[in-house]
Amino acid sequence: MKVLQEPTCVSDYISLSTCEWKMGGPTNCSAELRLVYQLVFLISETNMCVPENNGAAGCVCHLFMEDMVGADNYTLDLWAGQQLLWKGSFKPSEHVKPKAPENLTVYTNVSETLLLTWSNPYPPDNYLYEKLTYAVNIWNENDPTDSRIYDVTYQEPTLRIAASTLKSGVSYRARVRAWAQSYNSTWSEWSPSTKWYNAYKEPFEKHHHHHHHHHHH
């Protein structure tokens, strides 16, 4: 039994790290393998993760970690029974993939403005709580080419956009993801999307002027 692609891990920097690797051939990951991990610290327990299959030869393990600090370093040992297949280490703060933002809501009752809000997925005691910035993806349900990304480079989990920037009488969807620049993280997964109907209508004068102008052509 041989490891083809060594484990690579990412951490949500609150409680979960996910490690993935590939074996040399078809493997029943949960029956044949164990990933043992331990925080390099005075008082730390040895933990064991039972991997799941991710394809025929791929394995994935969810490592539970708690109360992370920036200096944390874990030893990782991949075992097949009594045989040590691979030994490595993992520093969560250097491989951060934030949790996805939650509770995305679109308010359409603010005059001529769409207000999108979501919640920061971290509690206030977590380092990432004040470090996240966001990207919001809005797309037309019926036209995949009508899609845009808004970068939210401030920390407030809200976005205001003019309803007039979207097509009227069309259903739109939005989703949001996060990243932490200070920890050089990857992007989080997208949040679940939320749907709304853009009922915005142009004011009459603007509408009238537009048609008058068009008539002259």
């Epitope: 979960l16 610290f41 708690e66 600090v69 509690p123 206030p124 380092y127």
Partner: antibody, heavy 116, light 112 residues
Framework: EVQLVQSGAEVKKPGATVKISCKAS????????MHWVKQAPGKGLEWMGR????????IYASKFQGKATITADTSSNTAYMELSSLRSEDTAVYHC?????????WGQGTLVTVSS | DIVMTQTPLSLSVTPGQPASISCRSS???????????LEWYLQKPGQSPQLLIY???NRFSGVPDRFSGSGSGTDFTLKISRVEAEDVGVYYC?????????FGQGTKLEIK
């Protein structure tokens, strides 16, 4: 042996500032959160705040926001707490504590007396 | 802020007899990572506090097995199966799940 050794007792006048130190030995403070806990005379324990020495990230109980400033120097393996605008209510023993992820190691406490 | 309420506030026990201290939190103290960071500390006279129990039920190393912790949700209990003279002091419960972290007001145990 794991130890947290705090600086000695202080007597300060109202309005003054005091800075207490907490030197760790037997472990690296970067591997833990360093917390501070207040104990007024004859009273219970009150959590004040904490720091992650690796990145300097601090959080405080709202009562101590603006009153306490927690810092850490990883090169000397020492955590500090500064208390400003001292008043008689600040008279207390202040404990530094390392938490990972529970308060396993406590300093001996530093008595700060505020008196005119 | 989460308020931790201990009962009783004082306790007088004959050596060899059991003792029980209750701690109630004003709201759930389950952390977002799924753990319940409920701890018990003993402060002996003239000393700094020392850890007895972490995560509700786990005894810290070196703590005698006469100490046990139990509970869930918002109700927690520390039991001493047979009190000894060295157990005197003030017992505090503590929640480390939600900022600001908070201690109970303390329970003073004395020997009859």
């Amino acid at each position: 042996e794991v130890q947290l050794v705090q600086s000695g007792a202080e007597v300060k006048k109202p309005g003054a500032t005091v800075k207490i130190s907490c030197k760790a030995s037997g472990f690296n403070i970067k591997d833990t959160y360093m917390h501070w806990v207040k104990q007024a005379p004859g009273k219970g324990l009150e959590w004040m705040g904490r720091i992650d020495p690796t990145n300097g990230y601090t959080i405080y109980a709202s009562k101590f926001q603006g009153k306490a400033t927690i810092t850490a120097d990883t090169s000397s393996n020492t955590a500090y707490m500064e208390l400003s605008s001292l008043r008689s209510e600040d008279t207390a023993v202040y404990h530094c504590v390392s938490r990972r992820p529970w308060f396993a190691y406590w300093g001996q406490g530093t008595l700060v007396t505020v008196s005119s | 802020d989460i308020v931790m309420t201990q009962t009783p506030l004082s306790l007088s026990v004959t050596p060899g007899q059991p003792a029980s201290i209750s701690c109630r939190s004003s709201q759930s103290i389950v952390h977002s990572n799924g753990n319940t960071y409920l701890e018990w500390y003993l402060q002996k006279p003239g000393q700094s506090p020392q850890l007895l129990i972490y995560k509700v039920t786990n005894r810290f190393s070196g703590v005698p097995d006469r100490f046990s912790g139990s509970g869930s949700g918002t109700d927690f209990t520390l039991k001493i199966s047979r009190v000894e003279a060295e157990d005197v002091g003030v017992y505090y419960c503590f929640q480390g799940s939600h900022v600001p972290y908070t201690f109970g007001q303390g329970t003073k145990l004395e020997i009859k």
